[in-house]
């Protein structure tokens, strides 16, 4: 058993069919000795008297939030959640896996640029009861400071008869330099509580992995006289590392016709313009890479041929 | 990438192609050795992230670009002395402070030259014969070294009478490519930058 | 006051199904797990197994898991055992009880339904 | 599972006499063992949780002690209502189960 805050306390339990339960001593927070009473949750039937009570923790049935009084009056609080282990593996029930880039991968996290600003969300399908905190650092030995926000309810979707719920945070390196070379992974911990059910995510990474440009701006097509060509220009996103010849993007320019099954002209290019044909009814999308690592491309940016 | 890429010209700055150069083929090193050493702890997140030149150069500091110099997290100064006789300055009146920058390249280079070099002729000796390292890699190595130009004490070849243990070394040639990636990417950086300036 | 009340004695032929129930009030409903209980004539207790009122969490005795289904409604604080189909075998007096939070035995007791089949 | 057997199968005494029941476990049930009172056409009574507490309402005549595999319930001194059948049950590993029973008699 240990606290996951005050007066909040994480019971671990093996999950198996023949498991014992988890013996716990409850201790009132008083100076009383006698008269003391315990109760649990909304009831008011006492389970024991005592400055301790000891109990058997084998069930979500015994967990809550145990109470002792003494003369009609409340003295101290205990809430005592439970974290299943199944066969030696902690559960992920709260969670849903996003098996992207890989199977039981339940947190996510993205950044703009190198600034140690970066963004995770999760998945859950769980819409009451439900909270999360995040914490983070870089390192785990030696840990260095990484601020997270309060996790926050970003989005629904319907996703076949289930509704689903994403929820992300928000996080910042303390004292991060754009141009340094990480060594020591970005941490990042969410807890998740539902009902009476602890569980914990994990997630490591470093800043350069999950770097994910926002689309090329203010992109422009300028006609090129007698001629089917048009040229293609655009700029750097403004949320994108500076300066911008260190940090450095390439770029990838598609035409693209109205049926995905046309085939699609591609152009690579290090430059903030090109050339390209544009075909009717067709459009023209830019995205845009670190140059020099590469991570995810950014989300496209479109304009029509017309 | 699998299309063409429309490159830049590298203008006036010689080096700025040789570390494009280098950045390509440790890349493509780095992608041989995680597909040949699949069941060896070869990827990002199963290696220790290992820096040779830790406390002998400081590339990321000395070619910190003047935007970032205000940036208080990036002033982690160290003290390293560094010779500042180079040829990629071409004709332009440089500062010291890129001198120091260049100069603590070329130093990074010689290292993981002496590293690779050593760890090549280990990996020779290996009955698996299953890995070694691209000689195209080691020859940009040196190019981009001569491009640089810097007159530095030449380091010996490290020779080991001991039996090589083939399986550390193929960790060690792991560790040492993710961390010469690295360092390329920052090379990369500041050809551009310089190029730029 | 504490009380669980049973539903009345059955007599059934072998192969008919069977509901059986067990009405709870004076307490909190549903920080209690209910349990079942069989007592076959003249015999010890067999402990059937236990079930939460909350999510319908359940655990069976292995010996009676496939022959009795468990099951509550939390509008109207009943917990329920069922058969769908009777053996002889099923002849006994059942027990539902409250199980106490934070220990796992059974501190307030039903009076019992007597199940009786025969052809 | 947990076997747990109960010994004597029948004991036979007198009101304002002690009576002793034990109760072996197969294998250790830590503390967590109750006993349970029945009279005949009624529904068992809980007396003892936890090897050794009093269930709220039960005379303090009744005691338990205990731990691991051998435990004990005793009456201090009978009273003429307590003459009925004892189990004890373990609740520390699935399936909880009961002991045999104990019948109390008067000689």
């Known amino acids: 058993i240990w606290e996951l805050k005050k007066d909040v306390y994480v019971v671990e339990l093996d999950w198996y069919p023949d498991a014992p339960g988890e013996m716990v001593v409850l201790t009132c927070d008083t100076p009383e000795e006698d008269g003391i009473t315990w109760t649990l949750d909304q009831s008011s039937e006492v389970l024991g008297s005592g400055k301790t009570l000891t109990i058997q923790v084998k069930e979500f049935g015994d967990a809550g939030q145990y109470t002792c009084h003494k003369g009609g009056e409340v003295l101290s609080h205990s809430l005592l959640l439970l974290h299943k282990k199944e066969d030696g593996i902690w559960s992920t029930d709260i969670l849903k896996d996003q098996k992207e880039p890989k199977n039981k991968t339940f947190l996510r996290c993205e950044a703009k640029n190198y600034s140690g600003r970066f963004t995770c969300w999760w998945l859950t399908t769980i819409s009451t009861d439900l909270t999360f905190s995040v914490k983070s650092s870089r390192g785990s030995s030696d840990p260095q400071g990484v601020t997270c926000g309060a996790a926050t309810l970003s989005a629904e979707r319907v996703r076949g008869d289930n509704k689903e719920y994403e929820y992300s945070v928000e996080c910042q390196e303390d004292s991060a330099c754009p141009a340094a070379e990480e060594s020591l992974p970005i941490e990042v911990m969410v807890d998740a509580v539902h009902k009476l059910k602890y569980e914990n995510y994990t997630s490591s990474f470093f800043i350069r992995d999950i770097i994910k440009p926002d689309p090329p701006k203010n992109l422009q097509l300028k006609p090129l006289k007698n001629s089917r060509q048009v040229e293609v220009s655009w700029e750097y996103p403004d949320t994108w590392s500076t300066p911008h010849s260190y940090f450095s993007l390439t770029f990838c320019v598609q035409v693209q016709g109205k049926s995905k099954r046309e085939k699609k002209d591609r152009v690579f290019t290090d430059k903030t313009s090109a050339t390209v044909i544009c075909r009717k009814n067709a459009s023209i999308s830019v995205r845009a890479q670190d140059r020099y690592y590469s991570s995810s491309w950014s989300e496209w940016a479109s304009v029509p041929c017309s | 990438r699998n299309l063409p890429v429309a490159t830049p010209d590298p203008g006036m700055f010689p080096c700025l192609h040789h570390s494009q150069n280098l950045l390509r083929a440790v890349s493509n090193m780095l992608q041989k050795a995680r597909q040949t050493l699949e069941f060896y702890p070869c990827t990002s997140e199963e290696i220790d992230h290992e820096d040779i030149t830790k406390d002998k150069t400081s590339t990321v500091e000395a070619c910190l670009p003047l935007e970032l110099t205000k940036n208080e997290s990036c002033l982690n100064s160290r003290e390293t002395s560094f010779i500042t006789n180079g040829s990629c300055l071409a004709s332009r009146k440089t500062s010291f402070m890129m001198a120091l920058c260049l100069s603590s390249i070329y130093e990074d280079l010689k290292m993981y030259q002496v590293e690779f070099k050593t760890m090549n002729a280990k990996l020779l000796m290996d009955p698996k014969r299953q890995i070694f390292l691209d000689q195209n890699m080691l020859a940009v190595i040196d190019e981009l070294m001569q491009a640089l130009n810097f007159n530095s004490e030449t380091v010996p070849q490290k020779s080991s009478l001991e039996e090589p243990d083939f399986y550390k070394t193929k960790i060690k040639l792991c560790i040492l490519l993710h961390a010469f990636r690295i360092r390329a990417v920052t090379i990369d950086r500041v050809m551009s930058y310089l190029n730029a300036s | 006051e504490v009380q669980l009340v049973q539903s009345g004695a059955e007599v059934k032929k072998p192969g008919e199904s069977l509901k059986i129930s067990c009405q709870s009030s004076?307490?909190?409903?549903?920080?209690?797990?209910i349990g079942w209980v069989r007592q076959m004539p003249g015999q010890g207790l067999e402990w059937i197994g236990i079930?939460?009122?909350?999510?319908?969490?359940?655990r069976y005795n292995p010996m009676f898991r496939g022959q009795v289904t468990m099951s509550v409604d939390k509008s109207s604080s009943t917990a329920y055992l069922q058969w769908s189909s009777l053996k002889a075998s099923d002849t006994a007096m059942y027990y539902c009880?409250?199980?106490?939070?934070?220990?796992?035995?059974?501190?307030?007791w039903g009076q019992g339904t007597m199940v009786t089949v025969s052809s | 599972e947990i076997v747990l057997t109960q010994s004597p199968a029948t004991l036979s005494a007198s009101p304002g006499e002690r009576a002793t029941i034990s109760c072996r476990a197969s294998q250790s049930v830590s503390s967590w063992l109750a006993w349970y009172q029945q009279k005949p056409g009624q529904a068992p009574r809980s007396l003892i949780y936890?090897?050794?507490n009093l269930q709220s309402g039960i005379p303090a005549r009744f005691s338990g002690s205990g731990s691991g595999t051998d435990f004990t319930l005793t009456i201090s001194s009978l009273e003429p209502e307590d003459f009925a059948v004892y189990y004890c049950?373990?609740?520390?590993?699935?399936?909880?189960?009961f002991g045999q029973g104990t019948r109390l008699e008067i000689k």
């Open positions: 079930m939460s009122p909350v999510d319908s969490d359940i």
């Open positions: 004076g307490y909190s409903f549903t920080t209690y797990w």
């Open positions: 936890s090897a050794s």
């Open positions: 049950q373990q609740y520390n590993i699935y399936p909880y189960t």
């Open positions: 009880a409250r199980r106490r939070p934070g220990q796992g035995y059974f501190d307030f």
